[in-house]
């Protein structure tokens, strides 16, 4: 920043609440879509351009005037893998986090006209092109359909779909939110011959019911009913099928071949948790027991002579955890070699760090190809010579991310491709590879302004800068911006990382109010090297508040010793560690220990509430947005992963003594703002309603705000502005700021 170290002499404006709410300073992205190994699409002034990766030259793929007469606002587009058709999405209606319905039309790029015959129906739930060519699979009214050609009639694959009961090719609420992080439960084979799909049965799953108030003119509120399994409740069941799309005909029903779960899963409740095609005729399925410390991978081959799928027991791979649960949130996906006879997978090693292991399908044991007191975040690409991965190894910073390549013929030959490119500005990378990994886009998201660059895998040469946010940089030169500090403290001989957003002209000899921004859920990370323009930027820049975050026990990417510390004990160590962090920050000399606040959303709202209800005396006030209050109220898949079952034989005692309500009395010592959306399908309004009731019952005065018809994100334009304005007032009042 230009200007002076002296705050009084700095005449530049600060980053205001309005700047945040109106998004005055916009980070520019460079969102590309690879369409081959050397070409990508990029949208510029609503024209779709096709770029040559090697030379950087571009041509217009589709002019912005093409759909002037279309008559609908296009929400998204998707080009068929053979480049012959474009799928246009409109009439978008959001459902849950990932799910939505929409209308679709198909435009023939050769004929330069919309296809008017055999159109996809309105209110379609999911559509996807086959990986090659231009077949389409879609889900409508919970049933699956396939189009061999965009202008041909659809072949109906399933006939059992029923709203809120049977879901074919799409996920129910809990699978969408907690297992697949997607609405889709369809998986094309690499050449588009086979279509695999899951079927979920929610017949016995209890319904969550809540009012939706809608327009003022609605005399009686609508009741929304969603099959939602809470901890210990009846779960959905799952079946898995594969259909050969070459067999489809209008005059006979499609034959779907079922692949059943392994015997070790069928003995009790279980989940399907990963589907990965290994080759054209080999598929891997991962299954997980309801008690999520035991998973099995099946590898199944197509038998052409019988038309069935065979999963040999000798090829099963078991993954289990003795200290917690399998995977970070679920078992990681396998990355198969071209022949499908081996794969690479991120699993926990003996020391409890997540690293890449090399498996051969017919052998039980695997060979770790990475090791160290750091973790592999993700496998990004696999070629015949190299495996590319992102890790947080560099400089021992768990909150950093860099791209590495490892030579498959010699695992000792590891190269960091991003570490030294721009080490001051860029310490947190993600990557997007071309179809065969000949080129890659590096996306640096901090600590400096985001930077997007293109590279060649042949020599790892940087080809060009795609976006450097120089315009934003110039604008921010005229703003008093906060600085970000990323460091660690040592507790019980263990490093715990924190970040602080420090006010402009930060002076360690002065005393600042501190707001602890908390999430603290299992495998979370709030201390990182990412550049953000958010509410904290305003609080630090304009209100001179330090906004800190701390990754304590339970946090991720630092080994299972830290992450699994809270196994079966949510609401304990991760809560205590936030309190201890605040104490440590108080000792640093620049924190006004009479003005320490805490806030969080979702799991962060739970931890905030548990901290405020702890009676620690450290915090003056806090804000909980959409908090969990009792784990029996939250969904089965997430909750039971960490807590087991709420039964006397399992972990009922800790379910009962980890509630916010049981701490109600201690809220007399703090100022509390409780906020929730009434239409929260995820963390139900029930959770805050029960906190409110408990506080009222013991005579606690507190502040509360509900957001009518808002879901877990409270993201509508008006509600978003209202909540942050409201929270700002609360924090300023708490800190006695003008």
């Amino acid at each position: 920043n230009k200007g002076t170290d002296d705050a009084t002499a700095d005449s530049r404006k600060t980053y205001t609440l309005t700047d945040y709410l109106k998004n005055t300073y916009r980070l520019k992205l460079y969102s590309l879509r690879w369409i081959s190994d050397h070409e990508y699409l990029y949208k510029q002034e609503n024209n779709i351009l096709v770029f040559n990766a090697e030379y950087g030259n571009s041509s217009v793929f589709l002019e912005n005037s093409t759909f002037d007469e279309f008559g609908h606002s296009i929400n998204d587009y998707s080009i068929s893998p053979d480049g012959q058709f474009i799928l246009l999405e409109y009439n978008y209606v959001k459902q849950w986090r990932h799910s939505y319905t929409a209308s679709y039309d198909i435009y023939d790029l050769n004929k330069r006209q919309l296809i008017t015959e055999e159109r996809i129906p309105n209110n379609t739930q999911w559509v996807t092109w086959s990986p090659v060519g231009h077949k389409l699979a879609y889900v409508w009214n919970n049933d699956i359909y396939v189009k061999i050609e965009p202008n041909l009639p659809s072949y109906r694959i399933t006939w059992t779909g029923k709203e809120d009961i049977i879901y074919n090719g799409i996920t129910d609420w809990v699978y969408e939110e907690e297992v697949f992080s997607a609405y889709s439960a369809l998986w094309w084979s690499p050449n588009g011959t086979f279509l695999a799909y899951a079927q979920f049965n929610d017949t016995e799953v209890p319904l969550i019911e809540y009012s939706f108030y809608s327009d003022e003119s609605l005399q009686y509120p609508k009741t929304v009913r969603v099959p939602y399994p809470k901890a210990g409740a009846v779960n959905p069941t799952v079946k898995f099928f594969v259909v050969n799309t070459d067999s489809l005909s209008s005059v006979t029903n499609a034959t779907s071949i079922q692949i059943t779960a392994p015997a070790s899963m069928l003995i009790g409740d279980h989940y399907l948790c990963d589907v990965t095609w290994a080759t054209q005729e080999r598929i891997s399925l991962q299954w997980l027991r309801r008690i999520q410390n035991y998973s099995v991978m099946d590898i199944c081959d197509y038998d052409e002579s019988s038309g069935r799928w065979n999963c040999l027991v000798a090829r099963q791979h078991i993954e289990m955890s003795t200290t917690g649960w399998v995977g970070r949130f679920r078992p990681s996906e396998p990355h198969f070699t071209l022949d499908g006879n081996s794969f690479y997978k991120i699993i926990s090693n003996e020391e409890g760090y997540r690293h890449i292991c090399y498996f051969q399908i017919d052998k039980k044991d695997c060979t770790f190809i990475t090791k160290g007191t750091w973790e592999v975040i993700g496998i990004e690409a696999l070629t015949s010579d190299y495996l590319y991965y992102i890790s947080n190894e560099y400089k021992g910073m768990p909150g950093g991310r860099n791209l590495y390549k490892i030579q498959l013929s010699d695992y000792t030959k590891v190269t960091c491709l991003s570490c030294e490119l721009n080490p001051e500005r860029c310490q947190y990378y993600s990557v997007s590879f071309s179809k065969e990994a000949k080129y890659y886009q590096l996306r640096c998201s901090g600590p400096g302004l985001p930077l997007y660059t293109l590279h060649s895998s042949v020599n790892d040469k940087g080809l060009r800068v795609l976006e450097d946010n120089s315009a934003l940089d110039k604008m921010l030169q005229n703003v008093q911006m906060p600085s970000k500090k990323l460091d660690f403290i040592i507790l019980n001989e263990t490093k715990f990382w924190y970040q602080m957003i420090l006010p402009p002209h930060f002076d360690k000899s002065k005393k600042y109010p501190l707001l602890l921004d908390v999430y603290a859920g299992p495998c979370s990370q709030k201390a990182d090297t990412v550049f953000r323009l958010n509410w904290a930027t305003y609080l630090a820049s304009t209100e001179n508040i330090i906004v800190a975050s701390f990754d304590g026990r339970g946090s991720g990417y630092q080994g299972d010793k830290i992450m699994h510390a809270i196994n079966r004990r949510l609401g304990t160590f991760e809560v205590e560690d936030q309190i201890e962090a605040a104490r440590q920050f108080s000792k640093m000399g620049f924190v006004d220990n009479k003005r320490i606040a805490i806030w969080g959303w979702s799991y962060g709202g739970y931890v905030t509430s548990m901290v405020l209800g702890s009676g620690s005396g450290v915090f003056k006030c806090g804000i909980a947005v959409a908090p969990v209050s009792r784990w029996e109220y939250y969904d089965s898949v997430y909750t039971e992963r960490y807590m087991g079952l709420p039964t006397p034989e399992d972990n009922l005692d800790h379910y009962r003594n980890s509630t916010v309500m049981s701490r109600a009395e201690n809220f007399k010592q703090v100022e509390y703002l409780l906020i929730h959306g009434t239409a929260d399908d995820n963390v139900h309004f029930q959770q805050s309603a029960q906190i409110s009731k408990a506080l009222v019952d013991v005579g606690v005065d507190f502040q509360a705000m509900w957001y009518t018809d808002e879901d877990h994100g409270i993201a509508s334009s008006t509600a978003h502005q209202h909540i942050y304005t409201h929270m700002s007032h609360f924090i300023k009042q708490c800190f006695s700021l003008p």
Partner: antibody, heavy 116, light 107 residues
Framework: EVQLVESGAGVKQPGGTLRLTCTAS????????VHWVRQAPGKGLEWVGV???????DYDAAFMSRVTISKDTSKSTVYLQMNSLRAEDTAVYYC??????????WGQGTTVTVSS | DILMTQSPSSLSASPGDRVTISCRAS??????LNWYQQKPGQAPRLLIY???NLQTGVPARFSGSGSGTDFTLTISRLEPEDFAAYYC?????????FGSGTKVEIK
Amino acid sequence: EVQLVESGAGVKQPGGTLRLTCTASGFSLTTYGVHWVRQAPGKGLEWVGVIWGDGRTDYDAAFMSRVTISKDTSKSTVYLQMNSLRAEDTAVYYCMRNRHDWFDYWGQGTTVTVSS
Amino acid sequence: DILMTQSPSSLSASPGDRVTISCRASQDIRNNLNWYQQKPGQAPRLLIYYSSNLQTGVPARFSGSGSGTDFTLTISRLEPEDFAAYYCQQSIKLPLTFGSGTKVEIK
């Protein structure tokens, strides 16, 4: 390369049985259905029946009682058996591959004559 | 059963002529109609599937149109090798049925 070859041609006795073989190559009988169609001398095409990839069969009602279509996937062969032959069963019999809703490959045909 | 009626049953034409053959279904078959060509002593060959889609390798002078109950096969410029019998076939419902055929002869 996809090919279908019919065999079993010849002169059959009225009241007798014919068994035609269709040998397929270049595709899997567990994926694609195989149909039989016949064509009487100087006449049009008449659908007889089909065996689908999963082994299910469908027949024209006119042949239901006396026709059986079967297959041996290990030998890549499809069979058409017709009982109680009569003179009007004299025809060229074709087998064809089912590609979705059309017949994309046909055999060359095999001639069956029913005569005493 | 769905009855397929083809007309004319035969026609005479010269090379270079434009020829249209009609096929009518006894009920709505949407676009589920295919056209086949059969030369003497040979098996039929697929020309058009699903009313208007040209099978790979078939010359562009062949085209199909129609939906519901009325369909047309058009040969824009007749070539000597096009003299043959032509059959329509519905594929929407079992039993599958063919038209009785149209024989295109040299004038």
